[in-house]
Interface confidence: low
C-alpha cells in the first residue's frame, strides 16, 4: 500500500531546485494543489540529491508554524492546529476538515548537517464543493489514464508484497514475541533512553511499545519526564529513506 | 519584534516579598511554556518555575529550593508571566530571567537583578 | 537532579580559530540538551537544541554534536561576537539543569 501512495505521490512531484553555494540537494513537492472545503488534502516534500543528514522538517503556513519532525523527539503539532493537523505520512503533513481560509502558501523547511536549510513550497487552494466538481471534469481523461496505469502497477506491487509477507509473518511473529518479553522484563526502552525510529514513547516509565507507522496513533503522547521544556512528541520520525 | 519586557527589581529584606512580571509580545503568548531563571556567581544559571498552557490547565512546575514560597502565574489577555516571591532568603539573590519555549521558538527576556540583604 | 559537568571553564582563543566546549551529563538525558549563549550584557540566546539542530538565525559557524552522554558545541571559525559565556541545559527531566558555563575570551 505504501509503494502504491509513493507512485501516486511520485505523479505529481514538482522539482524546486536550491542555487546555493554547496548545497546540492533538490527538494520536491505536490506543487499547486486544489482540495475541496471540507475535505482534507497531504502535504508531502522530499529531499534528495543531497547525501546530508536531515535534523528536522518544519511545516509552516505563510509565518504560522504548523508543525515539526524533530529526528530525536518525534512529531510536534502547534497547539493552534492540533485540532486540524495530523503527522504524515511519512515526513509529510495532513490537513483535515479544510476551509476557504486554508488556502495560500504552505512550506516545507528541511534542516540538515552540513548542508543547511532546504525549503519547498505549496500553494494550496481549497475550493467550494461545486467548483471543485467543475474543476474536476476536465482532468477525468487523463486521470482515468493515469489511473488505469496506477492500479496495474500497484495491483503487482501489492501481490509482491503479500506474498513476501507471508513469507516472512511466522518470522517477524517470534521476533516481536521476543521484543515485549525482553522489553517488559528489561526496560531497555526506558524514559531516559530513545525510541527507536517508527516507534512513539509511552506515558510514566513503562517501556516504549511498536506503535502504527510513525504516527504514535495508540500511543500516548512522551510523557512530561521525556522533555520538560515543551516539546511535546507524537513519536518519533524516520528520516532514514529521506535523502538519496 | 519579539520582546520580553522584565519588571523592575530591587531591594527586598529577608523575610520579605517581591512580584516580578515579564510582558511578552511579539509572538503568541498563549503557545509558550513560560519558565523563570535565575542566576548568581555562587549557583550560576538555575530554573525556578514553570507555568504551561491553558489547555494544560496552566500546570506549573517549581525547583526544590523555592517550593511553597514562589508562585508561578500568568494572564493570556495581557500576554503576561509572574513570579510571585515569599519568604525571600540571602539564597535567592541574583538576576531573574523570564523565559519562553515553544518547540523550536525560544525566548529569554533581560535580567531583573533581585537582592535579598538586610 | 541530573549533573551537567561542562568544560572547561574558561577559554582563550583567536579570531578564525576553531573551539570546541563540552558538556558530560550525569545521567540519560538521550540528546535532550541545548546550548545557550550569554552576551557580556547578560542577554541570553539559545543557538542549538536536541543536542545538534541550529536555531533559526544562528551562523552555521555553530555546530552541536552528541556522543553518548558526551556533548558537544564547535565554532568553526571565531568571529568577535562568539566572544561571550556559554552554557549548556538539559530538558531531559525535573528540573532542567545548566552546566557550570564556559567563559570564551579573546586571546
Known amino acids: 500500500m505504501r509503494w502504491c501512495l509513493l507512485l501516486i505521490w511520485a505523479q505529481g512531484l514538482r522539482q524546486a531546485p536550491l542555487a546555493s553555494g554547496m548545497m546540492t540537494g533538490t527538494i520536491e513537492t505536490t506543487g499547486n494543489i486544489s482540495a475541496e472545503k471540507g475535505g482534507s488534502i497531504i502535504l508531502q516534500c522530499h529531499l534528495s540529491s543531497t547525501t546530508a543528514q536531515v535534523t528536522q522538517v518544519n511545516w509552516e503556513q505563510q509565518d504560522q508554524l504548523l508543525a515539526i519532525c524533530n529526528a530525536d523527539l518525534g512529531w510536534h503539532i502547534s497547539p493552534s492546529f492540533k485540532d486540524r493537523v495530523a503527522p504524515g505520512p511519512g515526513l509529510g503533513l495532513t490537513l483535515q476538515s479544510l476551509t476557504v481560509n486554508d488556502t495560500g502558501e504552505y512550506f516545507c523547511i528541511y534542516h540538515t548537517y552540513p548542508d543547511g536549510t532546504y525549503t519547498g513550497r505549496i500553494f494550496l487552494e481549497v475550493l467550494e464543493s461545486s467548483v471543485a466538481e467543475h474543476g474536476a471534469r476536465f482532468q477525468i481523461p487523463l486521470l482515468g489514464a493515469m489511473a488505469a496505469t496506477l492500479v496495474v502497477i500497484c495491483t503487482a506491487v501489492i501481490v509482491v508484497v503479500a506474498l513476501t509477507r507471508k513469507k516472512k509473518a511466522l518470522r517477524i511473529h517470534s521476533v516481536e514475541g521476543d521484543l515485549r518479553r525482553k522489553s517488559a522484563g528489561q526496560e531497555e526502552w526506558s524514559p531516559s533512553a530513545p525510541s527507536p525510529p517508527g516507534s512513539c514513547v509511552q506515558a510514566e516509565a513503562a517501556p516504549a511499545g511498536l506503535c502504527g507507522e510513525q504516527r504514535g496513533e495508540d500511543c500516548a503522547e512522551l510523557h512530561d519526564y521525556f522533555n520538560v521544556l515543551s516539546y511535546r512528541s507524537l513519536g518519533n520520525c524516520s528520516f532514514f529513506t529521506e535523502t538519496g | 519584534e519579539v520582546k520580553l519586557e522584565k519588571s523592575r527589581g530591587g531591594l527586598v529584606k529577608p523575610g520579605g516579598s517581591m512580584k516580578l512580571s515579564c510582558v511578552a509580545s511579539?509572538?503568541?503568548?498563549?503557545?509558550?511554556?513560560m519558565n523563570w531563571v535565575r542566576q548568581s556567581p555562587e549557583k550560576g544559571l538555575e530554573w525556578v518555575a514553570q507555568?504551561?498552557?491553558?489547555?494544560?490547565?496552566?500546570?506549573?512546575h517549581y525547583a526544590e529550593s523555592v517550593k511553597g514560597r514562589f508562585t508561578i502565574s500568568r494572564d493570556d489577555s495581557k500576554s503576561s508571566v509572574y513570579l510571585q516571591m515569599n519568604s525571600l532568603g540571602a539564597e535567592d539573590t541574583g538576576i531573574y530571567y523570564c523565559?519562553?519555549?515553544?518547540?523550536?521558538?525560544?525566548?529569554w527576556g533581560q535580567g531583573t537583578s533581585v537582592t535579598v540583604s538586610s | 537532579d541530573i549533573q551537567m559537568t561542562q568544560s572547561p571553564s574558561s577559554l582563550s582563543a583567536s579570531l578564525g580559530e576553531r573551539v570546541t566546549l563540552t558538556c558530560r551529563a550525569g545521567?540519560?538525558?538521550?540528546?535532550?540538551l541545548s546550548w545557550l549563549q550569554q552576551k557580556p550584557d547578560g542577554t541570553i540566546k539559545r543557538l542549538i537544541y536536541?543536542?545538534?539542530t541550529l536555531d533559526s538565525g544562528v551562523p552555521k559557524r555553530f555546530s552541536g554534536r552528541r556522543s553518548g552522554s558526551d556533548y558537544s558545541l564547535t565554532i568553526s571559525s571565531l568571529e568577535s561576537e562568539d566572544f561571550a559565556d556559554y552554557y549548556c541545559?538539559?530538558?531531559?527531566?525535573?528540573?532542567?539543569?545548566f552546566g557550570g558555563g564556559t567563559k570564551l575570551e579573546i586571546k
Open positions: 523565559h519562553g519555549n515553544f518547540y523550536d521558538l525560544d525566548y
Open positions: 511579539g509572538f503568541t503568548f498563549s503557545n509558550f511554556w
Open positions: 507555568i504551561r498552557l491553558n489547555s494544560d490547565n496552566y500546570a506549573t
Open positions: 545521567q540519560e538525558i538521550s540528546g535532550f
Open positions: 536536541a543536542a545538534s
Open positions: 541545559l538539559q530538558y531531559a527531566s525535573y528540573p532542567p539543569t
